[in-house]
């Protein structure tokens, strides 16, 4: 029974530009349950905010609704993986809004 | 500092129109959504109108759809919204407001507000 | 008539607790967080809780937000005299694809 491994952000998408989900494949689960929280903060901002809707995108997902992708141009994602024996983290993900398609 | 500084208001006759305006300082204004807030005397707060950061996207109430149209000019950092066939109903405190600090959907900085009376 | 509803007024007395409600529907508190604003006499609303419970930096601990199901509630402890203002709670609703606020309630001090 080992701490998770680490998980990495690998993609993020925008049907229509009015909203965008970000998905993660998960490390080693250590052989124990494990839980995983997507985190997002500004740009010189060091404050997190946690992901609004782990549900419309699936599975290890993070959607991100209109009300979220029309006030910030930039998000910076991180993911959390935590069971009984520690917590791993990815590695931070830069997202300009504009450039996910 | 973050500024955020309505102008535009005034007295308009029913079925007129006007555009207000909000200059913003202190914050890069290219990078964030704006949104239009109003307040009628002694009534309550009354979300108006919404536009993304680029401009791309607007949103308005049901109350204002087809009369107001909400824009920006990131180059002059300034939000407008034109008001057409203003009604009586429309009489209100107009206040522009960011979500900078807090999470995406706070609005965590408003102006002053403009008055206008229809 | 508001989307959301809260009762027009509260009102406690100094060093009390005091409960604000908010009830929506799926459309919007129920699939969305909520802010609430605080709005003291003659001044400009001021974000007091964010993402249902959340505090903007020098917004006291006194202040507490949570939701459940469709409906949010603000509660302030330890009342205070200058809490007397008028607080509006606020969700994007998916159906309008736009924001809604309460109606607002006004607390007051007795």
């Known amino acids: 029974q080992l701490p998770p491994g680490k998980p990495e952000i690998f993609k993020c998408r925008s049907p229509n530009k009015e909203t965008f989900t970000c998905w993660w494949r998960p490390g080693t689960d250590g052989g124990l349950p494990t839980n995983y929280s997507l985190t997002y903060h500004r740009e010189g901002e060091t404050l997190m905010h946690e992901c609004p809707d782990y549900i419309t995108g699936g599975p290890n997902s993070c959607h991100f609704g209109k009300q979220y992708t029309s006030m910030w141009r930039t998000y910076i994602m991180m993911v959390n993986a935590t069971n009984q024996m520690g917590s791993s983290f990815s590695d931070e993900l830069y997202v300009d809004v504009t450039y996910i398609v | 500092e973050v500024q955020l500084l309505e102008s535009g208001g005034g007295l308009v006759q029913p079925g007129g129109s006007l555009r207000l305006s909000c200059a913003a300082s202190?914050?890069?204004?290219?990078?964030?959504?704006m949104h239009w807030v109003r307040q009628a005397p002694g009534k309550g707060l009354e979300w108006v109108s919404l536009?993304?950061?680029?401009?791309?996207?607007?949103y308005y109430a049901d109350s204002v759809k087809g009369r107001f149209t909400i824009s920006r000019d990131n180059s002059k950092n300034t939000l407008y919204l034109q008001m057409n066939s203003l009604r009586a109903e429309d009489t209100a405190v107009y206040y522009c407001?960011?979500?900078?600090?807090?999470?995406?959907?706070?609005?965590?900085?408003w102006g002053q507000g403009t008055l206008v009376t229809v | 008539q508001s989307v959301l509803t809260q009762p027009p007024s509260a009102s406690g007395t100094p060093g009390q607790r005091v409960t604000i409600s908010c009830s929506g529907s799926?459309?919007?508190?129920?699939?969305?967080?909520v802010n609430w604003y605080q709005q003291l006499p003659g001044t400009v609303p001021k974000l007091l809780i964010y993402?249902?419970?959340k505090r903007p930096s020098g917004v006291p601990d006194r202040f507490s937000g949570s939701k459940s199901g469709t409906s949010a509630s603000l509660a302030i402890s330890g009342l205070r005299s200058e809490d007397e203002a008028d607080y509006y709670c606020?969700?994007?609703?998916?159906?309008?694809?736009?924001?809604?606020f309460g109606g607002g309630t006004k607390l007051t001090v007795l």
């Open positions: 606020a969700a994007w609703d998916d159906s309008l694809s736009g924001w809604v």
């Open positions: 799926t459309s919007n508190i129920g699939s969305n967080t």
């Open positions: 536009i993304s950061w680029d401009g791309g996207s607007t």
């Open positions: 202190g914050f890069t204004f290219g990078s964030y959504g």
């Open positions: 407001a960011s979500s900078i600090s807090a999470a995406a959907t706070g609005l965590d900085y």
């Open positions: 993402e249902n419970k």
